[in-house]
């Protein structure tokens, strides 16, 4: 009854520092409240990038100051992370928790390696 979470292995951020990927979970139960968290793993350190709790059938809402946005459809969440720079290149893990009703389930994806390349500055034109 473990919950499986799938996400793409690799994503390349756009030149504007935006990366999008789909996080899909196989729900073992009929959850009405789901929490989705994006974690970044660098070396052995794990940090939270953003998190949102949503009711099934409703929209996914991150905090106003979050660098993440997203939409949900059934057991699929479309995540977008913005404001990324080359130093943010790393492994981004999708974590899904079925919060309500009981029982609680935890699902952790294998991670999406996001590559971010800072755009070259435009040359001065004489």
């Amino acid at each position: 009854k473990a919950m499986h979470v799938a996400q793409p292995a690799v994503v390349l951020a756009s030149s504007r520092g935006i990366a999008s990927f789909v996080c899909e979970y196989a729900s073992p139960g009929k959850a009405t409240e789901v929490r989705v968290t994006v974690l970044r793993q660098a070396d052995s350190q794990v940090t939270e990038v953003c998190a949102a709790t949503y009711m099934m059938g409703n929209e996914l809402t991150f905090l106003d100051d979050s660098i993440c946005t997203g939409t949900s459809s059934g057991n699929q969440v479309n995540l977008t992370i913005q404001g990324l720079r080359a130093m943010d290149t790393g492994l981004y893990i999708c974590k899904v928790e079925l919060m309500y009703p009981p029982p609680y389930y935890l699902g952790i994806g294998n991670g999406t390696q996001i590559y971010v390349i800072d755009p070259e500055p435009c040359p001065d034109s004489d």
């Epitope: 009854k1 473990a2 919950m3 499986h4 073992p28 409240e33 929490r35 968290t37 974690l39 794990v46 940090t47 939270e48 998190a51 709790t53 974590k95 919060m99 309500y100 009981p102 029982p103 609680y104 389930y105 935890l106 952790i108």
Partner: antibody
């Protein structure tokens, strides 16, 4: 540094109540699920209760459901366990533990002993 | 509820020897949600391994975890004097969170 410190344990008579506290420091308290785990003398570990993030969701072991209430005060960075209708079998060392971002219990307090005896 | 059964109950070994501890689950547990803890007398448990095989911060590399499905193993490659303690496995993939009954590693 990251730390959890429990308090509030003691000797109490069966049927009475007790409130345990767990003061957290060194991390963003509201980003983590917080658990209570107990250990009867000479026995193994038993999970008791968890409270999530903003406190909206809580889960309990069947053995304490309806008698214990877990809560948290984010402004005080403190976790609580209100224990009512205590029984002799609730005698144990009570630990608070942080559920890390990947789910394991990575930080534990030193424990507070609760003895239920007449 | 997922029941975890640890074996053996007690392991009597000498420093320098290899310790192999087993944890068997009553139903399949994803390796992402299996942890091992060490507990010494009078102390709180300490996280050793999470995700079945990842060492927690500061844990020496003589500790390793492996396994999948229903069978998991904690191995201590060469026992140091400070490793004699009780070890617990735990699953945290679904509620209720459950622990094994523990394996005591004692000095022979």
């Amino acid at each position: 540094q990251v730390q959890l410190v429990e308090s509030g344990g003691g000797v109490v008579q069966p049927g009475r109540s007790l409130r345990l506290s767990c003061a957290a420091s060194g991390f963003t308290f509201s980003s983590y699920g917080m658990h209570w785990v107990r250990q009867a003398p000479g026995k193994g570990l038993e999970w008791v209760a968890v409270i999530w993030y903003d406190g909206s969701n809580r889960y309990y072991a069947d053995s304490v459901k309806g008698r214990f209430t877990i809560s948290r005060d984010i402004s005080k960075n403190t976790l609580y366990l209100q224990m009512n209708s205590l029984r002799a079998e609730d005698t144990a060392m009570y630990y608070c533990a942080r559920g890390d971002l990947l789910g394991a219990f990575d930080i534990w307090g030193q424990g507070t002993m609760v003895t239920v005896s007449s | 509820e997922i029941v975890l059964t640890q074996s053996p109950g007690t392991l009597s070994l000498s420093p320098g020897e290899r310790a192999t501890l087993s944890c068997r689950a009553s139903q399949s547990v994803s390796s992402s949600y299996l942890a091992w803890y060490q507990q010494k007398p009078g102390q709180a448990p300490r996280l050793l391994i999470y995700g079945a095989s990842s060492r927690a911060t500061g844990i020496p590399d003589r500790f390793s975890g492996s396994g999948s499905g229903t069978d998991f193993t904690l191995t201590i490659s060469r026992l140091e004097p400070e490793d004699f303690a009780v070890y617990y496995c735990q699953q945290y993939g679904s509620s209720p969170w459950t622990f094994g009954q523990g394996t005591k590693v004692e000095i022979k």
